[in-house]
Interface confidence: low
């Protein structure tokens, strides 16, 4: 081995040293303060005056380009002159109710001019009026037990569905395909308000007036509606707005609970199917449609003015140039657009890719550049459908596919304060284990342990005893276009609640005027530990990444997910012994394929053992066979009806988008196989999805093969 | 080299409304990517932004004067105009069209001004 | 809006001398800053940019200083031909974009 070797792995430790001790809370805490002081909504003024703060910004902490990337995309925005509401209405057509037009601005924020009403982004116009039908949280199975258990048809109804369980996107686009005219969404007590805590300002709950905008898209991976697979720069072809991807058909709006108390206390039709269809507000929860007794004839309305406009939107790339690798890029983003103050999302998040920039520009100043180019990245539109980040990435997925090592993604760093959350890849759970093992626990009761010891405890793995839990890589997130389209190994980490003990959707005040700078100060994170934990993890895998001489990625834990995926979707199969018997479906052939990945791995790893590190050739070889394994399991042609979603391990659920899906070609062609027209036809997309993942899973193993 | 020049009546009446352009010669708007923007100039209330406009049709105004303000911008013969409707004798100022420093870099300092033209609200 | 407070108002200074002109925000604007100069009939020109760096054409005796909420225009050795109104401006919170009052300096 070479002698030089223990020398380069002392300042490799001693540098990550520097870069970690250099991270200070009080600087996110500073930085969370100025990025929070007005509204950052896509597509504003506002949000420009940051991109350009952080542009001057980086380059004064060190950076060798920054750079504006603009886009013109897609957005939609409230009429200002013409608000959206929904009103009761009887039967002469008078309005007897209205919803609020606007939430209460929170203490010290009165005078703050540009928050943007509650909206459902990307909702069309339309004024729907007609019968209520309450959906539950409006998912698949909903649906199903309405339509097929209960009997009860939404074809022309206005219906309304509590947030929460899956992406609102995926609600919206279940109830269109249920028939319905309009849709309204709520905060549900049940879902946002958490049990002996106060409302904002005084705790960190939902108040009654509080509501959750958001975008209600379904894109899948597309980015801008109206440019998808291309950058939304000024040579693109744009389709006409009846072709654009993704859009939703019907109205939509959301409201907060003390309106939905209004439309949901008279409603009529039956008793909710079962206790999980009860929220928390003092209504019957009966299911419509329509209104009951004396209320019968009157009809809710919706009046709906919003508008889409292609509008310019502003990335912020900071390049910090690699002294040895430079045609390697290890890239940390997180986007900037927030739908009003942004307090957590994403703000809790910019903030420590701002210290992290900070730190990493400190070193270079001081002569210690990375071993690979780190690419920083300030997003835009991530609220309208992660198009920053996709507009980016078409636009330099040649670079990005040949010379993409790795994304982490730097959304909030909080959504609680109770454990670590980490979703990844397979090639970076032993990278998260080991660094996680190195940094010391924020958690009281943990002083002197490591964050591995306390999120191991308070988050332990389903599946390996002593181990903590890693979640497979859904969507919803800037991470998207990178894993699920280019294959590029991705990563993201934050604070969590207590899933056991609290169970509310996302954090109470999620996309709220009420998610504010002193929501984090006073109830999340007063000392700002929780955010440096994160930004020591989000750091440390940027750092290793960026640094290690052999890349820490570990192929045998893809084999073992692997192995454990084919097993999961072998037993889902399974529950139809007959139809696998009579089309003779056989999962054979993926287990074999799997088998010998595992074979192969083994054997690379052993290899990688031997690798002498100071032959430049060898090591890149071997760090090439790694950086391109995330690549191997991207197929060109995309799932069926999701082109966008490439990758045959892993994509978003089809039923809910913030979800991941393991061999996701294959559980989509066996989702509600039993209730298809055509057996034969459906059996035989089974086989033909088995097939893919194992020609993938083959082929993956393959590059893992000594090259010559 | 890059020059603006402004023009548009001296004199306007209280209640109707003021039209001024700028012609920007020696530099295309499309292709310069430079952002152009108005400032008023009065002895009481000093210099003050009005508004900037970009090539896209992206518009930046002044909140004091967005709703009487438009920004408009043909880029085939190189001008820009600005409109402000019901003036008072409070827009009685001297106008200027600026041009906001380097390529991309947005709303920043004002490089390049024009010469400036009086306009008096009387009737 | 960030209000932007220049003193003092009025400085008399003989040629030669050093001129210190200073410009308060109310809020901080990093290094966003800008400084104008404007004679009498004429339209305003720029001196400075990102708080200290000249414009182009701009003499090395005028420099530029400060960061945050303090800011300072300097002329090293005055001349008479820098008898004009000067300007601070802030690009940082907008909108709208602010200036100063001004600081007329006038040459003895």
């Known amino acids: 081995k070479p002698s030089n070797e223990a020398t380069g792995n002392v300042s490799h430790s001693g540098m990550k040293k520097e870069f970690l001790h250099e991270l200070k809370a009080e600087n996110i805490k500073k930085f969370l303060y100025n990025f929070t002081r007005t509204p950052h909504l896509a597509g504003t003024q506002n949000n420009f005056e940051l991109a350009k703060q952080i542009h001057d910004q980086w380059k004064e902490f060190g950076l060798d380009l920054v750079e504006l990337s603009h886009y013109d995309v897609l957005l939609s925005y409230p009429n200002k002159t013409h608000p959206n509401y929904i009103s009761i209405i009887n039967e002469d057509g008078n309005e007897i109710f209205k919803t609020s037009l606007s939430e209460q601005p929170p203490p010290g924020y009165e005078n703050i001019s540009d928050v943007v009403p509650p909206y459902s982004a990307f909702s069309p116009q339309g004024t729907p009026e007609g019968d209520l039908v309450y959906v539950n949280y409006a998912r698949t199975e909903d649906f199903f037990k309405l339509e097929r258990e209960m009997k009860i048809s939404c074809s022309g109804k206005i219906v309304i569905a509590r947030y929460g369980k899956v992406f609102r996107g995926n609600m919206v686009k279940n109830a269109q395909l249920a028939g319905a005219k309009g849709m309204i969404l709520y905060s549900d007590p049940a879902d946002y308000f958490v049990p002996a805590v106060k409302s904002y300002p005084d705790g960190w709950n939902l108040p009654g007036g509080g509501v959750q905008r958001g975008n209600v898209l379904n894109l899948n991976g597309a980015g801008d509606p109206l440019t998808p697979g291309y950058p939304a720069n000024e040579h693109a072809y744009r389709h006409e707005l009846t072709n654009a991807v993704g859009l939703p058909s019907i109205p939509v709006h959301p409201i907060g609970y003390d309106d939905a108390q209004k439309l949901l206390e008279h409603m009529g039709g039956p008793a909710p199917p079962d206790s999980s269809w009860k929220g928390g507000l003092k209504v019957p929860y009966n299911v419509g449609p329509g209104f009951a007794g004396n209320f019968s004839t009157q009809k809710v309305k919706m009046h709906i003015h919003s508008y889409t406009k292609v509008t310019r939107i502003y990335n912020v790339i900071g390049t910090l140039k690699g002294a040895l690798e430079p045609d390697r890029y290890v890239i940390l983003g997180g986007h900037r657009d927030a739908w009003v103050f942004g307090g957590i999302d994403p703000q809790s998040g910019a903030a420590v890719v701002h210290e992290i920039v900070r730190s990493f520009g400190t070193l270079k100043k001081k002569g210690r550049r990375p071993r690979r180019t780190i690419l920083f990245a300030s997003w835009d539109a991530e609220e309208f459908g992660l198009l920053g980040s996709t507009e980016w990435a078409e636009e330099h997925s040649r670079l990005l596919q040949e010379r993409g090592v790795a994304y982490i993604n730097a959304d909030s760093s909080i959504e609680g304060n109770y454990t670590l959350r980490v979703d990844c890849t397979p090639l970076m759970y032993s990278l998260v284990y080991n660094l996680t093992k190195e940094l010391q626990s924020p958690d009281e009761g943990f002083e002197g342990k490591s964050l591995y010891d306390s999120w191991k405890e308070k988050s332990p793995s389903p599946e390996f005893i002593g181990m903590p839990r890693i979640s497979k890589l859904g969507s919803g997130n800037d991470f998207e276009v990178f894993f699920q389209r280019l294959g590029i190994a991705s990563g993201r980490a934050r604070y969590t609640k207590n899933w056991k003990t609290n169970k509310v959707s996302s954090y109470p005040l999620y996309h709220s005027v009420y998610e504010t700078y002193e929501l984090v100060v006073k109830f999340y994170d007063p000392t700002f530990k929780y955010h440096l934990t994160v930004a020591q993890v989000r750091g440390a895998m940027v750092f290793e990444l960026a640094n290690s001489i052999v890349l820490p990625f570990d192929c045998q834990s893809y084999a073992v997910a692997l192995k454990k995926y084919a097993d999961t979707i072998y037993n889902i199969s399974m529950k139809h012994p007959q139809e696998m018997k009579a089309y003779m479906i056989s999962f054979d052939s993926l287990f074999s394929a799997v088998n010998n990945f595992t074979d192969v791995a083994s054997k690379f790893n052993q290899r990688l053992q031997e690798l002498d590190k100071s032959n430049p050739i060898l090591l890149r070889i071997m760090n090439d066979q790694l950086m391109y394994l995330e690549r191997a399991f991207i197929d060109p042609l995309g799932l069926p009806g999701r082109p966008f979603y490439r990758h045959i391990i892993y994509a978003p659920s089809s039923h809910n988008k913030y979800a991941g899906e393991s061999f996701p070609g294959i559980y989509d062609a066996l989702f509600d196989i039993s209730s298809k027209v055509n057996a034969s036809k459906a059996w035989n997309e089974v086989k033909r999805q088995i097939s893919i993942a194992t020609f993938t899973v083959q082929a993956a193993a393959e590059t893992l093969r000594e090259v010559a | 080299q890059v020059q603006l020049q402004e023009s548009g009546p001296g004199l306007v009446k209280p209640s109707e409304t003021l039209s001024l352009t700028c012609t920007v010669s020696g530099a295309s708007f499309s292709s310069s990517g430079y952002y152009w923007g108005w400032i008023r100039q009065t002895p009481g209330r000093g210099l003050e932004w009005i508004g900037t406009m970009f090539y896209t049709g992206a518009t930046y105004y002044s909140p004091s004067l967005k709703r009487r303000l438009t920004l408009n911008m043909d880029t085939s013969k190189q001008e820009f105009t600005l409109r402000l409707t019901s003036v008072t004798a409070a827009d009685s100022a001297v106008y200027y069209c600026?041009?906001?420093?380097?390529?991309?870099?947005?709303?920043?300092?004002?490089?390049?001004w024009g010469h400036g033209t009086q306009v008096t609200v009387s009737s | 809006d960030v209000v932007m407070t220049q003193s003092p108002a009025t400085l008399s200074l003989s040629p030669g001398e050093r001129a210190t002109l200073s410009c308060t925000v109310s809020q901080s604007v990093s290094s966003y800053l800008a400084w104008y100069q404007q004679k009498p009939g004429q339209a305003p020109r720029l001196l400075i940019y990102g708080a200290s760096t000249r414009a182009t054409g701009i003499p090395a005796r005028f420099s530029g200083s400060g960061s945050g909420t303090e800011f300072t225009l300097t002329i090293s050795s005055l001349q008479s031909e820098d008898s004009a109104v000067y300007y601070c401006?802030?690009?940082?919170?907008?909108?709208?974009?602010?200036f100063g009052g001004g600081t007329k300096l006038e040459i003895k």
């Open positions: 401006q802030q690009y940082n919170h907008w909108p709208p974009l602010t």
């Open positions: 600026v041009r906001h420093r380097g390529p991309d870099s947005g709303l920043d300092a004002f490089d390049l």
